[in-house]
Each structure stands twice: as structure tokens, then as C-alpha cells.
């Protein structure tokens, strides 16, 4: 038999201890939230909020401007000063809870934990390729706001998610806030609301639509809003909340809430339970049927998918898919599966399931005993009745009231448990060529860039590297600017190329040349590198013979 070169084991063909230095910015405090802006004339910025300060950075992470956002009551607070002479309420530190772009103007809107959760609008002032913030506008009209009716109280100290939608000549803020009894009593934000920014930026229009956890449930029923996004005709919120109102706090599960992005109304507010599971190829005895549940969403991101993954998910290339990283939760018993799993929920399928759920509730024959649900927001009722009514009223439509869809949407881990002990804390998904890549941050301060594919029994790494020596968790917010992603860990912001930080972690020529084309890797004498790093011969097509 002919002699053959011994095969290099797959794991030996790469080294994830290789150090990569990526550009970073030290923010001077724990990064609380971050967002990027790309203008239409090549101007761009990264906005980074820490306690009492907002940094404006260039795309190279060099500081352009810095603004004091607190403490409230401090004469040096630049945003507070925009609200005129005080006092404006209790003094204290400002933790930025919301940092969003109002793309139509364009402007940056920041909302903090101080000053009743009010927001500030910062017009963007392009200066060449840099962006400066104009003097902030205070989105708060003192004489319009009371503790029980406060259109300008947006952010909750317990956490708020905002998605901005342009409708006609107006911007609507879709706001979701975590509440408890104390927060609800103090210039009460609402759980879910849609607020129109007034054209003169003096605040938000009164009489806005809202849903709130009913006072009797505020103590036990807590909703965490993990992510929000706008795609197509809808705005979506992702929540982690108790599975049952009556057993709250009890076991948690994950829900998707859907709101119309074309009508600022909440009558067609819908919720759907998302179910993510780990189903090992070979099921152990005693393992649950259908796989091990991972009910608690950690992070999420929606993105259009490349051709390969689209085929595996039986959807069209470019369709929008919601990706979520789920964990087992505290009360799930001894874990035999991975720490984190990733599930993919095609948006079109989510919408179809929701629409079918509405039909089941509102079209006869209605299944007896089918509940409208959302008893933490509204009076209990059975379909097709409106909330709180024993029987349908002739002049009210079943469809014009919030509804929890009776079925859940179940998916299994895309990575087949291969993430193992990795605890994923950040996620951003991109499409590169026909490949879909998950860019993940971890609890120990690493970045994993992995191809998303269902059919493999190993992970196809673009990279796996440490952001630094601090080992601090990578935070939930990830932003994109051109070909780079921005991750935050501790007090640092890092700029990570979408195609990976480099190729040096591929140790063999064969492995190097099998890397995805978008990575730009080639063999360079005795190492894997990119063409610009390679003074000598650089080869992308074939390897030199092994002697």
C-alpha cells in the first residue's frame, strides 16, 4: 500500500491562544450602552455611554467629543442644563439606559436613569468625516408631566429597550421598560408604549398608547426586555418573563412581542412563546423528549441569512432570521448539555404562527377554553371575547385587542451543543458571501466568530481570540460600522473586523487555504496571513509539498 502523509488532527491545525491586537478605546468607566452612526456622506461615529458621560468617537475609536450627562443636580451636567434652571428632581448619577439613533433627522437620543427617565436629543453635526453632537435638547416639558401621566418619562432604571420608527413626518419611539412597584409609582414609565416625538423636540406627544403590568402583579411579575428590532411591517420585543402569572416569579420563559410599525396602536399587540432546545444526536436515557429546554434568552440579533444556512432552514436566501442565545435558567436541574445554545427563528414563520393564532382565537369555531392570555396586562378573558368581557360585544372586534398566541415556536440548537462550556453574552450575525457568521462575545472576554451551519459536528471558526487580559464579560450591545463590529467589555470598546482579526491562528497550510474566501487568508512561507502582511510569496491556491 502506498505511503501517505499522516493527517494533522483538526484541533492541531489551529491555535486559539494566538494574540490579536484590535483597536480599542478606554471609556473611563463601565460601558453601559453603545451605538454607531453611518451618514450618507461618509461621516461616521461610535457613541459610547458610561455613568455620567457620553463619548463621541470616530470610526478609528479616537475621541472626538465628550459630554457630561450627570450627576443630575451637578452644575457640570451638560444635558441637565438643557432643561433650564432646576431643580428637576432628586440628584444622583445618570446611568444611560437608552442610546438610539433617530435616523430621520439624524440625531442621537439618550435617556438615563435620573431625572424621571427623561431623554435628550442631540442633533448630529457632521464635520468632514467626523460627527459632533449639537447642544442637547431636553425632551421634557415640566408642566406636561405628572407622576401618573408622564409622556416624557421614558427610561426605567430597571432597563428599557427602544426602537425608533419613521411614520409619515413623525418619529415614533417603541418603548419597552422593566417595572416594579417602586418604579411604576414614580413618574411611571409603561411596560410597552408607542410615543411620538414632537416635531419641535420639546418632548413626546401626550395621550400615547401603552400597556403596563397591572398594579396587583407588579411585585411578582417582572418582565426583562432583552432586545428590540424593526423589520418589515412590525416592531418586535424579546422578553424573559415568568411562564405563569399565578405562579410568578416561578419558572421563566422567553417571548416575542409583535407590534405594528405602520400604525401607532396596540390593539394588534401579539405575544408568542419562543422555545429553544438542545437535542443531542444520541439521546441519553432519561433525557427529555424533544430535547433539553433552554428557556431563558440571553442575547438576540436579527439578520438576513446567506444561501447555505437559508437552504438548511428551508427559507429563501436573504430572508430575515431572529437568532437567540439561550441558557437553561437557574431552576433547570443538573445540566448535562452546553452552557449556551443558539436557535434560529425565521421572521416569516414567526409572523405566520402569530397570524394563525389570531385566527384560532377570532374565527369560528373557536376552540372552547382558549384564553386570550396576557393576564398581567389586561383582564382575563376567553377567545373571542375582548379583555374583561364575558361575551363578545357586537361593536368590538376580537382582533383589536392584545393576544398571547396559544402555540409556541420550537427550535433546536444550531450548534448541536458544540459551544460546550462557553457562556455567550453578546451576539451579532452577518452575511458574508453566501455564508452566515455569528460573532459572539463570551463571559470570559473572548470573541468567537463562527459560521452558522446546522449539519456539521464541529464548529467552523473564523476566529476565537481574547479581547485582552481583563477577562471581563463582553456586553450585550454590539454595533456595526462598515466592515467592523464594535464590542464592549468592562471599560473598553473594541473594533473587530467582520472577516476576523487575522489568519495566524491557522497553523497548517491546508487549514489556512480552507478558510472562507472572505477572510482573505493565504499561505505565506511558513505561516497563514493576509496579503498585506506578507512580504514574500503569498499563496491562496495550493500548498507547498511537505518534505
Amino acid at each position: 500500500k502506498e505511503w501517505q502523509c499522516p493527517r494533522t488532527p483538526y484541533a492541531a491545525s489551529r491555535d486559539f491562544n494566538v494574540k490579536y491586537m484590535v483597536p480599542s478605546f478606554s471609556a473611563g468607566g463601565l460601558v453601559q450602552t453603545m451605538v454607531t452612526y453611518q451618514g450618507d456622506k461618509n461621516e461616521s461615529a461610535v457613541f459610547v455611554a458610561i455613568r455620567n458621560r457620553l463619548h463621541v468617537l470616530g470610526p478609528d475609536l479616537k475621541s472626538v467629543q465628550s459630554l457630561a450627562t450627570g450627576p443630575a443636580g451637578d452644575p457640570g451636567c451638560q444635558t441637565c442644563a438643557a432643561c433650564g434652571p432646576g431643580p428637576h428632581g432628586p440628584s444622583g448619577d445618570t446611568d444611560t439606559k437608552v442610546l438610539v439613533l433617530e435616523p430621520a433627522l439624524p440625531a442621537l437620543v439618550s435617556c438615563g436613569s435620573s431625572l424621571q427617565g427623561r431623554c435628550f436629543l442631540h442633533d448630529l453635526d457632521p464635520q468632514g468625516t467626523a460627527v459632533h453632537l449639537a447642544a442637547p435638547a431636553c425632551l421634557f416639558s415640566a408642566h406636561h408631566n405628572r407622576p401618573d401621566d408622564c409622556p416624557d418619562c421614558v427610561a426605567s432604571p430597571l432597563g428599557t429597550r427602544v426602537t425608533v420608527v419613521e411614520q409619515g413626518q413623525a418619529s415614533y419611539f417603541y418603548v419597552a421598560s422593566s417595572l416594579d412597584a417602586a418604579v411604576a409609582a414614580s413618574f411611571s414609565p409603561r411596560s410597552v408604549s408607542i410615543r411620538r416625538l414632537k416635531a419641535d423636540a420639546s418632548g413626546f406627544a401626550p395621550g400615547f398608547v401603552a400597556l403596563s403590568v397591572l398594579p396587583k402583579h407588579l411585585v411578582s411579575y417582572s418582565i426583562e426586555y432583552v432586545h428590540s428590532f424593526h423589520t418589515g411591517a412590525f416592531v418586535y420585543f424579546l422578553t424573559v418573563q415568568p411562564a405563569s402569572v399565578t405562579d410568578a416569579p416561578g419558572a421563566l420563559h422567553t417571548r416575542l412581542a409583535r407590534l405594528s410599525a405602520t400604525e401607532p396602536e396596540l390593539g394588534d399587540y401579539r405575544e408568542l412563546v419562543l422555545d429553544c432546545r438542545f437535542a443531542p444526536k444520541r439521546r441519553r436515557r432519561g433525557a427529555p423528549e424533544g430535547g433539553q429546554p433552554y428557556p431563558v434568552l440571553r442575547v438576540a440579533h436579527s439578520a438576513p441569512v446567506g444561501a447555505q444556512l437559508a437552504t438548511e432552514l428551508s427559507i429563501a436566501e436573504g430572508q430575515e432570521v431572529l437568532f437567540g442565545v439561550f441558557v437553561a435558567g437557574k431552576d433547570s436541574g443538573p445540566g448535562v448539555g452546553p452552557n449556551s445554545v443558539v436557535c434560529a427563528f425565521p421572521i416569516d414563520l414567526l409572523d405566520t404562527l402569530i397570524d394563525e393564532g389570531v385566527e384560532r382565537c377570532c374565527e369560528s369555531p373557536v376552540h372552547p377554553g382558549l384564553r386570550r392570555g396576557l393576564d398581567f396586562f389586561q383582564s382575563p378573558s376567553f377567545c373571542p371575547n375582548p379583555p374583561g368581557l364575558e361575551a363578545p360585544s357586537p361593536n368590538t372586534s376580537c382582533r383589536h385587542f392584545p393576544l398571547l398566541v396559544s402555540s409556541s415556536f420550537s427550535r433546536v440548537d444550531l450548534f448541536n451543543g458544540l459551544l460546550g462550556t462557553v457562556e455567550v453574552t453578546a451576539l451579532y450575525v452577518t452575511r458574508l458571501d453566501n455564508v452566515t457568521v455569528a460573532h459572539m462575545g463570551t463571559a470570559d472576554g473572548r470573541i468567537l466568530q463562527v459560521e452558522l451551519a446546522r449539519s456539521l459536528n464541529y464548529l467552523l471558526y473564523v476566529s476565537n481570540f481574547s479581547l485582552g487580559d481583563s477577562g471581563q464579560p463582553v456586553q450585550r450591545d454590539v454595533s456595526r460600522l462598515g466592515d467592523h463590529l464594535f464590542f464592549a467589555s468592562g471599560d473598553q470598546v473594541f473594533q473587530v473586523p467582520i472577516q476576523g482579526p487575522g489568519c495566524r491562528h491557522f497553523l497548517t497550510c491546508g487549514r489556512c487555504l480552507r478558510a472562507q474566501r472572505f477572510m482573505g487568508c493565504g499561505w505565506c512561507g511558513n505561516m497563514c496571513g493576509r496579503q498585506k502582511e506578507c512580504p514574500g510569496s503569498w499563496q491562496q491556491d495550493h500548498c507547498p509539498p511537505k518534505l
Epitope: L105, D123, H144, Q169, A199, A205, P206
Partner: antibody, heavy 116, light 107 residues
Framework: EVQLQQSGPELEKPGASVMISCKAS????????MNWVKQSTGKSLEWIGD????????RYNQKFKGKATLTADKSSSTAYMQLKSLTSEDSAVYYC?????????WGQGTLVTVSA | DIQMTQSPASLSASVGETVTITCRAS??????LAWYQQKQGKSPQLLVY???TLAGGVPSRFSGSGSGTQFSLKINSLQPEDFGSYYC?????????FGAGTKLELK
Amino acid sequence: EVQLQQSGPELEKPGASVMISCKASGYSFTGYNMNWVKQSTGKSLEWIGDIDPYYDGTRYNQKFKGKATLTADKSSSTAYMQLKSLTSEDSAVYYCTREGRGFAYWGQGTLVTVSA
Amino acid sequence: DIQMTQSPASLSASVGETVTITCRASENIYSYLAWYQQKQGKSPQLLVYNAKTLAGGVPSRFSGSGSGTQFSLKINSLQPEDFGSYYCQHYYGTPLTFGAGTKLELK
């Protein structure tokens, strides 16, 4: 469909007062400020002021303070503008227009003529 | 108050031509600017808001540009229905002010 229906033309004597109405339909009246704009014959447009029907809060262009008074009736979704101590300078078309980034919705205009 | 200076005051053009109207603000108004068209005896009609966003139903031959203090409205391939008066207006704080107008006439 958003509509703003203004009252008909007015012929007034100098020194008199006039009240113009603007009935809104097709949207939540209290959710948007109502603005008033003046246009003299062959001239440009001038912003008079606005009213927030939810709170009855008003803002005026300094030039029209004391001349115009803005009010709103929530129950009938109608905004009103009273012009007092009329002179020939007040002869113009007056428009109501709904708040927005740019005024997308206008009434048809009310012609006020002041003549002895 | 912010002054809006519009030019030219009047303009003659033929169907099919391209014309540009400019508007200068006396101070930085970022993108808080709208353009209107008004025909004789009619209410003004919103064309552009946020300096460059076309209002619903406005033909794509209209386009707005600029930010800060200098703005322009461009009309490509003039159509018979485009003749009339055009006004710019800022909404960056009160009082809102309009330009003096540009009368676009058929040559």
C-alpha cells in the same frame, strides 16, 4: 384620512374681532399641536403660533401676541383663532395646519377681509 | 429669530428643464427644514421635510439637499404642473419662519 376643515370667509370692520374655526378629523386631535399661519395677498407665509389641545398650552410668534388668541375644544376636535382690533394689515388668508416635521396637512384657508 | 433667505425671488423656465432654488438660514438649523409648493388660491403642499426626505406622493423629480445653513430644492425635468410658488421653512425652535418665496413661471 386626515382633514382640516376651516370656517368660511369673513368681512369685518376695522376695530372688530373675528373668530376662525378649524375642525380636525381622521386623527387623534389631542395628539398633535395645531399651528396657524397667515398669508397676505401676494406675500409669503408667517407663523402665528400653535396650541397643544391636550394641555391647552399655547405659543405665539412675538409679532402676533395680543393680536391672536388660540383655543381648542377637545370634545368637538376643533381649534379656534380669534383676531382682535382688526386693521387692514390683518386682511389675509389664515390657515390651520397640523404639527409635524414640515406641515403635511393644511386647512383650505379662511379669507379675512377688513374694510370700512 | 432665525431668518430664511430664499433665492431667486422669481425664475422663468421651460418644461423639461432642471431648476434649483436655494435657501439660507441665518443660523445652524441642522436638517430641520421643509419645502412647500403653492399654487394660486390653494393651500401650500409639503414637498420635502428633514431637508431631504420626500413627502408621501411627491414625484421623484423633486429632491432636497443641504444641512446646517445652506439648503436647496432641485426639480429635474420640469412638468407643467410644477409652476407656482415655492417656500422653505425651518422648524428648529420657535418662531417657525418661512422664506420669502420663489415664483417659478413658464418661460
